[in-house]
Interface confidence: low
């Protein structure tokens, strides 16, 4: 942290004789500069130079060869790197007076005669005398106005709207300023700034429109920053709305946008009379042409349980707005004939959500579903296959005799989705088959017994078990199972000898 620069002469203020020369020296631990009352055009007789010395400090000298009333004012020495537009200069000050019997008041620019008052705030009428000893009075149409005076600043007070004149007497001679006009403007201590972009996504050739509105404030400076600024692409407009309250609406229009106009559009409002600043930003994207992106939140193969309620949600990003439709097996989905509904909702400017809802899933709801999104520039689709999962059930369990050989085949037909597995079990002691422990799983590698499975279609399967010879009555169980459930049926196989005895009997 650098300590403040120092000034020689080491005084707060100094009175300099008219037409004489004076110099101010500034010493600092880093490079220093001077700020002084005149503008650069008026300062031909002000010279600033750097001076070498052995102290190790940086020294900058300000020299005035012939002092005039215009040189009256505040001289500030500051470190170069500390100067910012927003902040008041931080440095060391000295106020110089150059009394001139013919010039009672320091000359001002025309804008200084316009005094803006915010509501009932105090204001300064900046008539400054060239001599600190000169008595000054303030007048308006009603006479002398009581207000505190400081020769470095002017009259400070709460003023009503209208013209004011400063009057001074120097060596018996009366001097008057031209009128200072006091205007009252609506201004708040905080800036209420709102930005609006009806669209943030555009195509080439379209016109970008962004607005910023300032509420209850007339003392505002608003600046736009945007990608096409350097090319002067933007057309700015200000609309003042007085009713029901004060509102300044700034509009930036960028016609015939191109991809290069994509980026941040920023409005920065600054209150002209206070160091209050507010910024708002919106990101605009310009696309060469329209687009569609489909983002499903599910896979290309989905399963639904029988009678289940299920929603399939697809997120769509598109510009211009898309038309969204659903197909089943490449045919338009006719919703009123099924317990399937679809809807589309707009979530954000270019984001849409389409939902396919199965109310109570049925077997016939299985199939390929396609969402199609299209606009004038693009068409995109997404297809997924839906399988309705059905618990396994046994359709048929029959046996088939092989005549005199004594062999028998049992066929078990089952259906379900996913395709059921078929398992065979056998109970050899017919009297004990009510007891689950009497049943054993039929292994594939048992001699004299052959098991095989054939799938008939996507949801039907047939299992066969062939017994080379059935010598005594046995029970055979077919067990069909899938993820959703299992079913079993049993069949009694009678040995051919027993069967013939029964037939004879």
């Amino acid at each position: 942290q650098l300590s403040l620069p120092s000034i020689l002469p080491n005084e707060n203020e100094k009175v300099v004789q008219l037409n004489s020369s004076f110099s101010l020296r500034c010493f600092g631990e880093s490079e220093v500069s001077w700020q002084y009352p005149m503008s650069e055009e008026e300062s031909s007789d002000v010279e600033i130079r750097n001076e070498e010395n052995n102290s190790g400090l940086f020294v900058t000298v300000l020299e005035v060869s012939s002092a005039s009333a215009a040189h009256t004012g505040l001289y500030t020495c500051y470190y170069n790197h500390t100067q910012t537009e927003e902040n008041e200069l931080e440095g060391r000050h000295i106020y110089i007076y150059v009394p001139d019997p013919d010039v009672a008041f320091v000359p001002l620019g025309m804008t200084d005669y316009l005094v803006i008052v915010e509501d009932d705030d105090s204001a300064i009428i900046p008539c400054r005398t060239t001599d600190p000893e000169t008595p000054v009075t303030l007048h308006n149409s009603e006479g002398v106005v009581p207000a505190s005076y400081d020769s470095r600043q002017g009259f400070n007070g709460t003023f009503t709207v209208g013209p004011y004149i400063c009057e001074a007497t120097v060596k018996g001679k009366k001097f008057q300023t031209i009128p200072f006009n006091v205007y009252a403007l609506k201004a708040t201590s905080e800036l209420d700034l709102e930005m609006e972009a009806l669209k943030t996504v555009y195509k080439s050739g379209e016109t970008i429109v962004v607005t910023c509105a300032v509420f209850n404030n007339e003392v505002v400076d608003l600046q736009w920053t945007y990608p096409g600024e350097v090319k002067g692409k933007g057309i700015t407009m200000l609309e003042e709305i007085k009713v029901p309250s004060i509102k300044l609406v700034y509009t930036l229009t960028v016609p015939e946008a191109t991809v290069k106009d994509s980026g941040d559009y920023e409005c920065a409002a600054r209150q002209a009379t206070r160091e209050v600043k507010e910024m708002k930003k919106v990101t605009i994207s310009v696309h060469e042409k329209g687009f569609i992106e489909i983002k499903p939140t599910f896979s290309q193969l989905e399963a639904v349980n029988l009678h289940e309620v299920k929603h399939f949600v697809v997120e769509v990003r598109a510009y211009p707005p898309p038309r969204i439709s659903w197909l089943k097996n490449n045919l338009t989905l006719i919703e009123n004939l099924t317990e399937i509904t679809t809807d589309v909702e707009k979530i954000q400017e270019i984001r849409y959500r389409s939902k396919l809802k199965l109310i109570r899933a049925k077997e016939e709801d299985s199939g390929h579903y396609t969402i199609v999104a299209q606009n004038e520039d693009a068409v995109k689709s997404y297809t997924f296959e839906l399988l309705t999962q059905v618990p396994s059930s046994i359709l048929d369990l029959v046996d088939d005799h092989h005549g005199s050989t004594g062999g028998q085949t049992v066929r078990c037909t089952a259906e379900g989705t996913p395709l059921p597995d078929i398992e065979w079990m056998i109970c050899k002691d017919i009297k004990k088959c009510n007891n689950e422990t009497s049943w054993t799983i039929l292994a594939n590698n048992v001699s004299n017994i052959i098991t095989e499975i054939h799938s008939r279609d996507r949801s039907t399967v047939e299992g066969r078990v062939t017994f080379a010879k059935v010598e005594e009555t046995i029970a055979v169980r077919c067990l069909a199972k899938n993820l959703l459930g299992a079913e079993n049926r049993e069949l009694k196989l009678v040995a051919p000898t027993l069967r013939s005895e029964l037939t004879v009997a």
């Epitope: 499903p296 939140t297 599910f298 896979s299 193969l301 989905e302 929603h311 399939f312 949600v313 909702e345 979530i347 959500r353």
Partner: antibody, heavy 120, light 108 residues
């Protein structure tokens, strides 16, 4: 901004009742499914109950079935949980949570929670 | 009911590390899994939905993957604010909606 605020928690004796409320703001409440989730001290998250946007579909966890009742008043942007026959094991922080409009139904907005203590 | 088993139940790591948390479901399904982060005394926050979709406003160092029975939450480069408890949740088969038991991520 989108917000859920629970209230109604407190200390209650076993067998007693409490009614929790959840006030929603910043979004169209009637468009969203809602849930109650609880978290016992030092434990993980446990789903308690679900209600569809219109209130036509309601689910409960087995642990609260028959004792808790979920309801909603879309006109008042409010979700409720009536808790009867409270037990010590119902002691927890209770959160209301919004189901996101996404297939996976992630709970994208949560309240800050309200504490229920069941103790004699 | 579908059970969700998270592993590990706790994990120590350093800032900048890559960490992964796994969630195993007792039944196979596609995508219907969400991941949450919870800090002490706070409500859970949705990080990932539909197994791999990043919730708005969540840093891109978080990612989700997996299908079937095994799902993973990854944090590519741990930041100090990532130390918390993480939960997986399934909404494939409801009711009930079930959560994993949680993974506590601590600073090493």
């Amino acid at each position: 901004q989108v917000q859920l605020v629970e209230s109604g928690g407190g200390l209650v004796k076993p067998g007693g009742s409490l009614r929790l409320s959840c006030a929603a703001s910043g979004f169209t409440f009637s468009d969203y499914y809602m849930n109650w989730i609880r978290q016992a001290p030092g434990k993980g998250l446990e789903w308690v109950s679900f209600i569809s946007s219109s209130g036509s579909t309601i689910y409960y966890a087995d642990s609260v079935k028959g004792r808790f009742t979920i309801s909603r008043d879309n006109a008042k942007n409010s979700l409720y949980l009536q808790m009867n026959s409270l037990r010590a094991e119902d002691t927890a922080v209770y959160y209301c949570a919004r189901d996101g409009h996404i297939a996976a139904r992630g709970m994208d907005v949560w309240g800050q929670g309200t504490t229920v203590t069941v103790s004699s | 009911d579908i059970q969700m088993t998270q592993s590990p139940s706790s994990l120590s790591a350093s800032v900048g590390d890559r960490v992964t948390i796994t969630c195993r479901a007792s039944q196979s399904f596609s995508r219907y899994i969400n991941w949450y982060q919870q800090k002490p005394g706070k409500a859970p926050k949705l990080l990932i939905y539909a197994a791999s979709s990043l919730q708005g406003g969540v840093p891109s160092r978080f990612s989700g993957s997996g299908s079937g029975t095994d799902f993973t939450l990854a944090i590519s480069s741990l930041q100090p604010e990532d130390f918390a408890t993480y939960y997986c949740q399934q909404t494939y088969s409801t009711p009930p909606i079930t959560f994993g038991q949680g993974t506590r991520l601590e600073i090493k």
